[in-house]
């Protein structure tokens, strides 16, 4: 009775269970009643990352520096190259095929989360009591200066874009 299902790391072909090729190797010829599956190593700059019956290996991804990409993990016969972006840039997609400059947070907004090679800057509006007077990809909202702790008084109120202005207290003569 020919098998209808095969064991793990095997595949069914011509009513027969053949061994799959291991990661890093491609299929040259299926097994027969008398011969084992024939596999061949992937070429340089090619890979296969699973037990497979592929007749062609996949090409390694190229981390093109002209697109702002750099290598995060070199490819091998069993793994693809992993790309990331140069400092100050982040990937435009999960596949990281190109990069864009990190977004800056405008005045009135601060950095909630600094960008990484794979995610953009996350900005948040400065709440009452905090301000940001610069456009930056790193600066958080800063707290208003506390005039009281300096023995001064508020002469000009702060906003989400400006700090308070402190001045001397009016002394009664």
């Amino acid at each position: 009775e020919p098998p209808t299902a095969c064991r793990e790391k095997q595949y069914l072909i011509n009513s027969q269970c053949c061994s799959l090729c291991q990661p890093g190797q491609k299929l040259v010829s299926d097994c027969t009643e008398f011969t084992e599956t024939e596999c061949l190593p992937c070429g340089e700059s090619e890979f296969l990352d699973t037990w497979n019956r592929e007749t062609h290996c996949h090409q390694h991804k190229y981390c093109d520096p002209n697109l702002g990409l750099r290598v995060q993990q070199k490819g091998t016969s069993e793994t693809d190259t992993i790309c990331t972006c140069e400092e100050g840039w982040h990937c435009t997609s999960e596949a990281c095929e190109s990069c864009v400059l990190h977004r800056s947070c405008s005045p009135g907004f601060g950095v909630k989360q600094i960008a990484t090679g794979v995610s953009d800057t996350i900005c948040e509006p400065c709440p009452v009591g905090f301000f940001s007077n610069v456009s930056s990809a790193f600066e958080k909202c800063h707290p208003w200066t506390s005039c009281e702790t300096k023995d001064l008084v508020v002469q000009q109120a702060g906003t989400n874009k400006t700090d308070v202005v402190c001045g001397p207290q009016d002394r009664l003569r």
Epitope: P23, G43, E44, S45, H60, Y62, Q73, S77, T79
Partner: antibody, heavy 119, light 113 residues
């Protein structure tokens, strides 16, 4: 027997150019990635550039980017390094080395060729 | 870039003695896909080009005597020569083979006492 033979070294003036060659024999050249690695006199090893077996992938060290160009001619079993805008700090023995598709390591090195940049 | 730091810079050991040298990388060299550490050791004898000794941290290249062994994972690696022979006098370089730019340690020079 695997053989890698570099040539093209010599004395060059700062700002000048030089083209190094690496002649490969004893293996199927088109199946292997290739690297250039250099070694300044009395110093350690510094990777310079890589080119994949099929010419598709090329990477450079930041120190040479925009000045050096790696290339290969699989029909001639040859690897090249075009060096422009040479500086005194480029003075070194330049080695070519091959990379296979299994270990992904530099498994054979040539004897090297010395490039001296001086006025 | 990954910085490779080797220690000691040099050491003098008697013939037949055990030699141990260290290599540390500034970030992990573990390939997440195949769980191999891409740390390579090269040997450079005086006046000669480098020669591949060990790849994937601990796999000896064909023809390399079994007195040479590599170990470690992540960021800390070691090369050991179990019994030093006269022909082992050389500089030993560890190398990041995990990512570009490929980077080398400064080397450990092994001499005979």
């Amino acid at each position: 027997e695997v053989q890698l033979v570099e040539s093209g070294g010599g004395l060059v003036k700062p700002g000048g150019s030089r083209r190094l060659s690496c002649a490969a024999s004893g293996f199927t050249f088109s199946d292997y990635g290739m690297h250039w690695v250099r070694q300044a006199p009395g110093k350690g090893l510094e990777w310079v550039a890589y080119i994949s077996s099929g010419n598709r992938i090329i990477y450079y060290a930041d120190t040479v980017k925009g000045r050096f160009t790696i290339s290969r001619d699989n029909a001639k079993n040859s690897l090249y390094l075009q060096m422009n805008s040479l500086r005194a700090e480029d003075t070194a023995v330049y080695y070519c080395a091959r990379q296979d598709g299994y270990r992904y390591a530099m498994d054979y090195w040539g004897q090297g060729t010395l490039v001296t940049v001086s006025s | 870039d990954i910085v490779m730091t080797q220690s000691p810079d040099s050491l003098a050991v008697s013939l037949g003695e055990r030699v141990t040298m260290s290599c540390k990388s500034s970030q992990s060299l573990l390939n997440s896909g195949n769980q191999k550490n891409y740390l390579t050791w090269h040997q450079q004898k005086p006046g000669q080009p480098p020669k591949l000794l060990i790849y994937w941290t601990s796999t000896r290249e064909s023809g390399v005597p079994d007195r040479f062994s590599g170990s470690g994972s992540g960021t800390d690696f070691t090369l050991t020569i179990s019994s030093l022979q006269a022909e082992d006098v050389a500089v030993y370089y560890c190398q990041n083979d995990y990512t570009y730019p490929l980077t080398f340690g400064g080397g450990t020079k092994v001499e005979i006492k």
